[in-house]
Every structure is written in structure tokens, then in C-alpha cells.
Interface confidence: low
């Protein structure tokens, strides 16, 4: 299946050129998406190309600038946020990245009514998180691990918490492990729908072991970075949830929300908080052994000024075949009655589907079903439920948006996107305005991405928001590789793969093969999306075939495939990559003496194990920032899939699944090991231990470290990295420079 825009042939082929590495490193062929910043049912904000903040009204067709680029520039603002009452805008500047989602910044409040910055009671700096209330213009912010509240931007702050302490107590923001592995946000506070209450999490990291690494910087002595980071089996953060009345914050102060008894009996996690109404909140909890999740609906008791979570409003979700949920436990989407909700979880056949829960999980009504998976619930209105799935034409790597009419009986289902731009667009996400009056569709491929605006009632396309015309024109004289998405059926396992083929691909010829692997639990690499990246260049210019394979442990194809790796990481993921390579060789166009594998992070772990599998299939390979032992990685992630590294649990497999245990097997491959020394996520320790094991085994290998770089190896390191890897592969494949 060729998923690229068709091109002109022969006569114009001479004027066309291959991709260069420079194209990739310069981002020459990057695309744009358009996500409206909705502020009502029919209005949205967007930052124009010249940096003005413009308000668009879909119904009147009018637009006007609410904030000029001059005002933005006056404080070097890189981001903004309009208060719901439209009286103020916060301007964010001095962005300073911390971890994956977290950053600190300086915030200025601009008063739109008088066209001036708010003076007096200015915000402290740097702030860790700041947000408006959902109604009006209250501000909540986190500064030095404590939460503050302002009733109006110019007012003095009310300090909600006082115990915040760097690396010890975190209020309203997550610690490292909750940010990366549980919440996937920079914040841990949630306004109630009308801004009456503010809920927040407190994380106590006092007893967590600390990872320490050097940050070399430019000084005479390196700095030491210390992060409370629970590795597998270590002491975890202690979490508590509080709610405070923001109208009268000191009246009773923050009230703690009780933890369900069945959760509190042993180590546990808080996984998410969803407000239902101003006086009803839903909390999700998870046992440390992550196969039991409890959803608890709590109500405000006016007389006691406390939150009550009756046992009758506890809903248990349990997995008997793996862990609870997919990557995370799904979150509920409440219906208008404020008690029943829609939620994605496994059905009896082991496929994740939408269920409607009215009283108990046991009595849940299944809304979607089939040998495919519902992936995300976007919006529930009085009469419609919008969701995405990979149902259409049975391609797991696609995403289409569907509407189910829940206002009529029986409910009818309509695919909103399946036939819109069928060749160009097979992978969508959506963004809805209030009450789903309008929505934006963002198509990521396989053709050039396009963003469109639609009527929420009729699904009619209103206008194109972004169609990437410049990109389309720039690609007209580029010889892009061809892409195929197909499947292999092996031993009752379906292995979907994406193959990227050189532009003049000829099945009768032999090509070097590069496997790009990630392979982590609940991931998906084979997706119908557009990309012009490093592997596009390797196919276009260097004539390589690149393949991505989704094996056991990957997502959206049912629990059998997903949970196959439960408690056995590092076995089937590797096996399936090897199986696929053997199948590719059978296809006849692969030079079996020139096969390589590379991966980053979990992919670095899989590529290392594949190289050390002793199959003789791989000539060479690259591991970037690999995990080398699951004992070195974060508790929340690792234990979800592996259990605990204790004798009476799963210590044996923790020991058997290390890269170091296979050091001898690297003797017959060319191995390039790469890691950033300031990797807060997969610590440099992982590569240090691989290197030590290889040295002890007297195995030659190549290595590159990136000083003071984290898990992303960004900036100039990116250029150096891809240049270095290109040289390594070209040398391995005997390709001239």
C-alpha cells in the first residue's frame, strides 16, 4: 500500500533530488498543525504568524486582535493564557525546562480593560505552574513547591500550603516519577468546573532514594543533580489529595480526600482526578501492584465541610491477565446526570472498548465492540459521544473519529472522518469547542497533514485551518521514499510492519535493511502518519530499506498481544523483531549480510538484546539511551509490567533480562552505544553498566556520550548524534561517504 502523495514520473524525474541529512537536521520539511484555543462554543484564539493573539468568531466570521505582538514582545512572551472572564491575559516568558513536561517561567498579567500590565502584588519568579480558574479570573500558582491563590490578579496571594520543600514535599506539582510515569503533566492541581474548589496533590518524597549525577557546565567543579527517583522495588512517594474552598480558603482550610480502604491497605498510587460538578469529584487510585484500580466518586458535605467517598460509589477495575488499563488506566467521561460515566476498558474478548457505567462496573453497558480498540473519548454531549478508534478497514495504525448518537435508541454510529480525504488522511485527532458546537480535525497523515474546522451538528467542513501548502510545494522536487503498511501472520501472532523503501525500489535488487525499534509495552510504531525524518533520508539518499515492526506487547490490537510481555520484558519483543527480519529476508530483496537494528530508550534495550541474541542476523546496531536492567528504571513504569524485584515475586526475570548478562554475545556484532550524561529518565548508569560488562568480557564496541544532555539529546547534540549514527551505518553497510 503506497501511502505517499503520488508524483510526476520520468520526464521530471531528473529535476528531482533525494533528501539530504541537512534537510532533516534543519527541519526543512516539518509540518504545521492548527489546534484552536477554544474559549466558547463558537470562538477560539490563535497566535498568528506575526505573533498577534487573534480571537475568531466562527458564527460572525469576525476576528480581532486581543493582544498585540508588541505587548507579547515587551516581556518576551512565548505563551499566553486568557482568563475566562476575558479581563486578563497571563504572559509566559523565561521558559526554563525541567523534566519532560515541567518547566518554570516568569508570568506577567496584562489587564485587557485598561491595556496595562497589572502592577502591585506581582507574581514571584520563577513559577512552577500557573492557571486561571475555569470561571472569572482567580489564579492558582505553584511557587517553591507551595500553592498560592489570588482572587484577582492584582490581589495579594493567599498561601494554601506551607510545607513545600525542594525534593521533599511537592504541592500542586508532581515529583519526578508521578510526572513521567503516572500523571504525564506538569501540574497536580485541578479546579472544580465553576472554580469554587481547588483540588491538589501533595507528594511526600522524604524517604525516596535519590539519583545523583554530575552536571559539568562551565564551572571549575561540576554540579551534582539530585532527584528523588524510586527505582523498581524502592520506597515510593506518599501521595495525599486535598480540596480547598477557594472562595473562603481559610474557613476550614484544605480538606483531605479519603483513600478507599481496599487501596490504602498497602502501597498505592493516585492516578487521576476528574471533577464532575463543583461538589462532586472522582478520584482514581491504583495498587502498587498495578492490576487493581479503584475509581472513587466523592461528594462535598456542606454541613461538615468535608468530602465523603461512599463505598457504594467505588468502582473496581481489575486485570487478571496483565496490568490495569493500557499504558495508563483510562479516565472517566461523565454524562449530564453527573453520576454515570463512559470509560474505556477491556471487554470479555480482551479488546479495549467504551463502556457506560450507571451503577456498578459489573452492570456496565458495552457501547463499542469488535476486534479493534476504542482509543480515546473526546467529548460527551446530551446527544452524542465522540471517540477515536482503529476500526476502519482493520488497520490498527489508523485513527478515525466516530460519533455515536446516545440521545436516540438504538444508538447509531457514524464515522466522521473515514471518507473525508481517504488517501491523504487516515490518522486523526480532534479538538472540540464547548458543547461540541464546532470541532477541529487534525489529520497527521499518511499524506501531508491538514487541519480543518467542522460544524458539530452536521459534521460539515467549514474551512481549512492549515493545509501545509508550502510544505507540499517544497516536496514537489524531492524523491521521497515509498511506504508500505502490511502484516505478517506468524504462529497465530499478527505482526504489523511499516516498510520504507528507496524511491527507485526494485524488488529484484538487494538492499541493506535497518530495523527501527521501540517495542515498549502499549506503544505503537506502525502508524499511518506523515514524517520526513532521518529514516526517510536513509531510504531516499542512502538506498536503505527501513522497517518498523509492532510485536507482542504493543498496543491497540487486543489484550492477548498487549499482555503477552507481562512479567517477561525483553523476551517476546526481541523474538518478534527477529521473526520479522527472517520474514523480510524471505521476501528476496534484503541483503542478509547487511542488516542493522537501532532504537532509543526502550528501543535501545530491545536493539541491544536483539544484537546479543546470538542469531547472527545483525551485522551491527545502535542503542541510544538504553535501559540495561529493569532494576535501574522507575518503579511506577517497571513494576507495572514486571512486578517487584524480590525473591518471592519476579527477581529472577529482572536478573535474566539485563543487557549485561549477554555481554559475551556482542563479540560478533558492531555495537554503538550512546547516552547523555545528564539523563534524568534512563540514567547514564544503564550504559555505564553495559560498557563495564563489555570491557570485563573484553568485547570491542563503540560508544559516544553527550555531556550534560538528557534523554532527548536535543540541540546541537541532535545534529552530532544523527551525523555520527549515519557514518556508523554507512560504514557497517559499506556505503561510500
Amino acid at each position: 500500500i503506497v501511502l505517499r502523495p503520488s508524483r510526476v514520473h520520468n520526464s521530471e524525474e531528473n529535476t528531482m533530488r533525494a533528501l539530504t541529512l541537512k534537510d532533516i537536521l534543519n527541519g526543512t520539511f516539518s509540518y504545521k498543525t492548527f489546534f484552536p484555543n477554544w474559549i466558547s462554543g463558537q470562538e477560539y484564539l490563535h497566535q498568528s504568524a506575526d505573533n498577534n493573539i487573534v480571537l475568531y468568531n466562527i458564527e460572525t466570521g469576525q476576528s480581532y486582535t486581543i493582544l498585540s505582538n508588541r505587548t507579547m514582545k515587551s516581556v518576551n512572551a512565548s505563551n499566553y493564557g486568557l482568563s475566562p472572564d476575558r479581563q486578563f491575559v497571563y504572559l509566559e516568558s523565561d521558559y526554563s525546562k525541567l523534566w519532560r513536561y515541567s518547566y518554570t517561567a516568569t508570568y506577567y498579567i496584562y489587564d485587557l480593560s485598561n491595556g496595562e500590565f497589572v502592577r502591585g502584588n506581582e507574581l514571584p519568579r520563577p513559577i512552577q505552574y500557573l492557571c486561571w480558574s475555569p470561571v472569572g479570573s482567580k489564579l492558582a500558582y505553584v511557587y517553591q513547591n507551595n500553592i498560592y491563590l489570588k482572587q484577582r490578579p492584582g490581589d495579594p496571594p493567599f498561601q494554601i500550603t506551607f510545607n513545600g520543600r525542594e525534593n521533599k514535599i511537592f504541592n500542586g506539582i508532581p515529583d519526578w516519577v508521578y510526572e513521567e510515569e503516572m500523571l504525564a503533566t506538569k501540574y497536580a492541581l485541578w479546579w472544580s468546573p465553576n472554580g469554587k474548589f481547588l483540588a491538589y496533590a501533595e507528594f511526600n518524597d522524604t524517604d525516596i532514594p535519590v539519583i545523583a549525577y554530575s552536571y559539568y557546565g562551565d564551572e571549575q567543579y561540576p554540579r551534582t543533580i539530585n532527584i528523588p527517583y524510586p527505582k523498581a522495588g524502592a520506597k515510593n512517594p506518599v501521595v495525599r489529595i486535598f480540596i480547598i474552598d477557594t472562595t473562603y480558603p481559610a474557613y476550614v482550610g484544605p480538606q483531605e480526600v479519603p483513600v478507599p480502604a481496599m487501596i490504602a491497605s498497602s502501597d498505592y498510587y493516585f492516578s487521576w482526578l476528574t471533577w464532575v460538578t463543583d461538589e462532586r469529584v472522582c478520584l482514581q487510585w491504583l495498587k502498587r501492584v498495578q492490576n487493581v484500580s479503584v475509581l472513587s466518586i466523592c461528594d462535598f458535605r456542606e454541613d461538615w465541610q468535608t468530602w465523603d467517598c461512599p463505598k457504594t460509589q467505588e468502582h473496581i477495575e481489575e486485570s487478571r491477565t496483565g496490568w490495569a488499563g493500557g499504558f495508563f488506566v483510562s479516565t472517566p467521561v461523565f454524562s449530564y446526570d453527573a453520576i454515570s460515566y463512559y470509560k474505556i476498558f477491556s471487554d470479555k474478548d480482551g479488546y479495549k472498548h467504551i463502556h457506560y457505567i450507571k451503577d456498578t462496573v459489573e452492570n456496565a453497558i458495552q457501547i463499542t465492540s469488535g476486534k479493534w480498540e476504542a482509543i480515546n473519548i473526546f467529548r460527551v454531549t446530551q446527544d452524542s459521544l465522540f471517540y477515536s478508534s482503529n476500526e476502519f478497514e482493520e488497520y490498527p495504525g489508523r485513527r478515525n473519529i466516530y460519533r455515536i448518537s446516545i440521545g436516540s435508541y438504538p444508538p447509531s454510529k457514524k464515522c466522521v472522518t473515514c471518507h473525508l480525504r481517504k488517501e491523504r488522511c487516515q490518522y486523526y485527532t480532534a479538538s472540540f469547542s464547548d458543547y461540541a458546537k464546532y470541532y477541529a480535525l487534525v489529520c497527521y497523515g499518511p499524506g501531508i497533514p491538514i487541519s480543518t474546522l467542522h460544524d458539530g451538528r452536521t459534521d460539515q467542513e467549514i474551512k481549512i485551518l492549515e493545509e501545509n501548502k508550502e510544505l507540499e510545494n517544497a516536496l514537489k522536487n524531492i524523491q521521497l521514499p515509498k511506504e508500505e503498511i502490511k502484516k505478517l501472520e506468524v504462529d497465530e501472532i499478527t505482526l504489523w510492519y511499516k516498510m520504507i523503501l528507496p524511491p527507485q525500489f526494485d524488488r529484484s535488487k538487494k538492499y541493506p535493511l535497518l530495523i527501527q525499534v521501540y517495542g515498549g509495552p502499549c506503544s505503537q510504531s506502525v502508524r499511518s502518519v506523515f514524517a520526513v525524518n532521518w529514516i526517510s533520508y536513509l531510504a531516499s539518499k542512502e538506498g536503505m530499506v527501513i522497517a518498523l515492526v509492532d510485536g507482542r506487547g504493543t498496543a491497540f490490537q487486543g489484550d492477548k498481544l498487549l499482555y503477552a510481555v507481562y512479567r517477561k520484558l525483553g523476551v517476546y519483543e526481541v523474538e518478534d523483531q527477529i521473526t520479522a527480519v527472517r520474514k523480510f529476508i524471505e521476501m528476496g530483496f534484503i541483503d542478509e549480510k547487511r542488516i542493522a537494528i537501532w532504537g532509543w530508550s526502550y528501543g535501545g534495550y530491545v536493539s541491544s538484546l536483539a544484537l546479543a541474541s546470538g542469531t547472527g542476523l545483525f551485522k551491527c546496531g545502535i542503542a541510544v539511551a538504553p535501559v540495561s536492567s529493569w532494576e535501574y528504571y522507575a518503579s511506577v513504569y517497571t513494576e507495572r509490567f514486571m512486578g517487584l524485584p524480590t525473591k518471592d515475586d519476579n527477581l529472577e526475570h529482572y536478573k535474566n533480562s539485563t543487557v549485561m548478562a549477554r555481554a559475551e554475545y556482542f563479540r560478533n556484532v558492531d555495537y554503538l552505544l550512546i547516552h547523555g550524561t545528564a539523563d534524568d529518565n534512563v540514567h547514564f548508569q544503564n550504559s555505564a553498566q553495559i560498557a563495564k560488562a563489555l570491557v570485563n568480557a573484553q568485547v570491542d564496541f563503540q560508544a559516544m556520550w553527550y555531556s550534560d544532555q538528557n534523554h532527548g539529546l536535543s540541540g546541537l547534540s541532535t545534529n552530532h548524534l544523527y551525523t555520527h549514527m549515519t557514518h556508523f551505518l554507512k560504514q557497517c553497510f559499506s556505503l561510500s561517504d
Epitope: 482572587q151 506551607f162 473562603y248
Partner: antibody, heavy 117, light 108 residues
Framework: DVQLVESGGGLVQPGGSLRLSCAAS????????MTWVRQAPGEGLEWVSG???????YYADSVKGRFTVSRDNSKNTLYLQMNSLRAEDTAIYYC???????????WGLGTLVTVSS | EIVLTQSPGTLSLSPGERATLSCRAS??????LAWYQQKPGQAPRLLIF???NRATGIPDRFSGSGSGTEFTLTISSLEPEDFAVYYC??????????FGGGTKVEIK
């Protein structure tokens, strides 16, 4: 800048009435609790009455049934209607903006009420 | 109602000296206590809230401490403009809000 200006004080006979006003600028009174505090000559501070953002009113036992607190959001003005005044009501009356329902973060300069025959 | 007792009634000190003012609550009030300064002919001014937090614009020579029933306002080094009457106020249990009787800090 937040400013509170009281007016309406003066000399009144016992049993008489007065209406105090407090004009606010720099903030929207409707969003905050507002308070009246008084100070008898040479004495300490005494809380008199308060009104929440929601409109709920509160009174000290010593004035309950005689004083009424209200506000006009459109005028951004707070009022204290004082009836059946007594000699012990003689004081400087301050209007104050209340933070949440807690402490008093901005005060007016006060207006003097003298109850005497 | 909660009664607040301030001591001493009067504190005679010289500029540059340290002033320690006490406020005792008749029952525990957590940290729900504020301190105010009042100069002759002026309205009170908020100094400290939540027992230990300085209000906007208050110099750092002013500090508050305490929790439960015992609270202290400390002026580390008296400046001429600090001579005034100081009141504590609780907002733990209201109505009514109650004030202490005040401590007068005068020049020795």
C-alpha cells in the same frame, strides 16, 4: 490601586439612625467579603459586621438587630445602616476588604460616628 | 468566642532594639492569626497573615511565628516609624472575628 473611602459619619442622638458608605476602587467589591470594624476613642479594634461575596451577612452580637450591612455592586459601594444608636456605638468606623473570609488586607481611613445627646 | 490576650500592654524600647510581642488565644486556632500595625490618626495596616507570612510591602524586619495558642510578632531592629500600636486578630472561629487588646510600642 485598592482604595476605600468611608463617609456618612457625624453626630447623632441616641436612638437615631445613620447610614455609612464605603466607596471602593481598584477592585470589584462583588468578588470579596467586606467588613466593618470600629474603634471607640482610645480603645482597641472591634469587628462589627461583614458581608460575603455571596451576599451572606454577619453581625457582632452587640449590633445584631440594629445594624444592617449591604452593598451595591454597580456602584462598588458598601453600606452600614445603623438604627437605634447608643452612646457605646461612638467610634471611628472603618470599612475593610477581607481576604477570603480571614484577615483584612485593605482599610479605609475611617469615619467618626458620635452618639450623644 | 475566642479571646485573644496581648502582652505586654506597653513596650518601651529604643530604635535599633528588638521587639517581641505576644498574643495568646483562649483555644487553639491553628495558624489562623493576623497582625496589624496602627499609628495615631491612621487606619490599621496588615503586617502578617497565617501567623508567619508577611503581607505585600512589609519589610523583613517584621516576622511572625507560632501556632495553636501562642503567637509572637518580632521586630528585629526597631526603626523610628515602627513605634505604633500592634493588634493580633484570629479568623479561625467566626463570627465574630476577634482582636487582641493591642500592644503599644513606644520610644523609651
Amino acid at each position: 490601586d485598592v482604595q476605600l473611602v468611608e463617609s456618612g459619619g457625624g453626630l447623632v442622638q441616641p436612638g437615631g439612625s445613620l447610614r455609612l458608605s464605603c466607596a471602593a476602587s481598584g477592585f470589584s467589591m462583588s468578588n470579596f467579603a467586606m467588613t466593618w470594624v470600629r474603634q471607640a476613642p482610645g480603645e482597641g479594634l472591634e469587628w462589627v459586621s461583614g458581608i460575603r461575596g455571596s451576599g451572606t451577612t454577619y453581625y457582632a452580637d452587640s449590633v445584631k438587630g440594629r445594624f444592617t450591612v449591604s452593598r451595591d455592586n454597580s456602584k462598588n459601594t458598601l453600606y452600614l445602616q445603623m438604627n437605634s444608636l447608643r452612646a457605646e456605638d461612638t467610634a471611628i468606623y472603618y470599612c475593610a476588604k477581607t481576604w477570603g473570609t480571614e484577615y483584612f488586607d485593605y482599610w479605609g481611613l475611617g469615619t467618626l460616628v458620635t452618639v450623644s445627646s | 468566642e475566642i479571646v485573644l490576650t496581648q502582652s505586654p500592654g506597653t513596650l518601651s524600647l529604643s530604635p535599633g532594639e528588638r521587639a517581641t510581642l505576644s498574643c495568646r488565644a483562649s483555644q487553639p486556632i491553628n495558624n489562623y492569626l493576623a497582625w496589624y500595625q496602627q499609628k495615631p490618626g491612621q487606619a490599621p495596616r496588615l503586617l502578617i497573615f497565617s501567623a508567619s507570612n508577611r503581607a505585600t510591602g512589609i519589610p523583613d524586619r517584621f516576622s511572625g511565628s507560632g501556632s495553636g495558642t501562642e503567637f509572637t510578632l518580632t521586630i528585629s531592629s526597631l526603626e523610628p516609624e515602627d513605634f505604633a500600636v500592634y493588634y493580633c486578630q484570629q479568623y479561625y472561629d467566626w463570627p465574630p472575628y476577634t482582636f487582641g487588646g493591642g500592644t503599644k510600642v513606644e520610644i523609651k
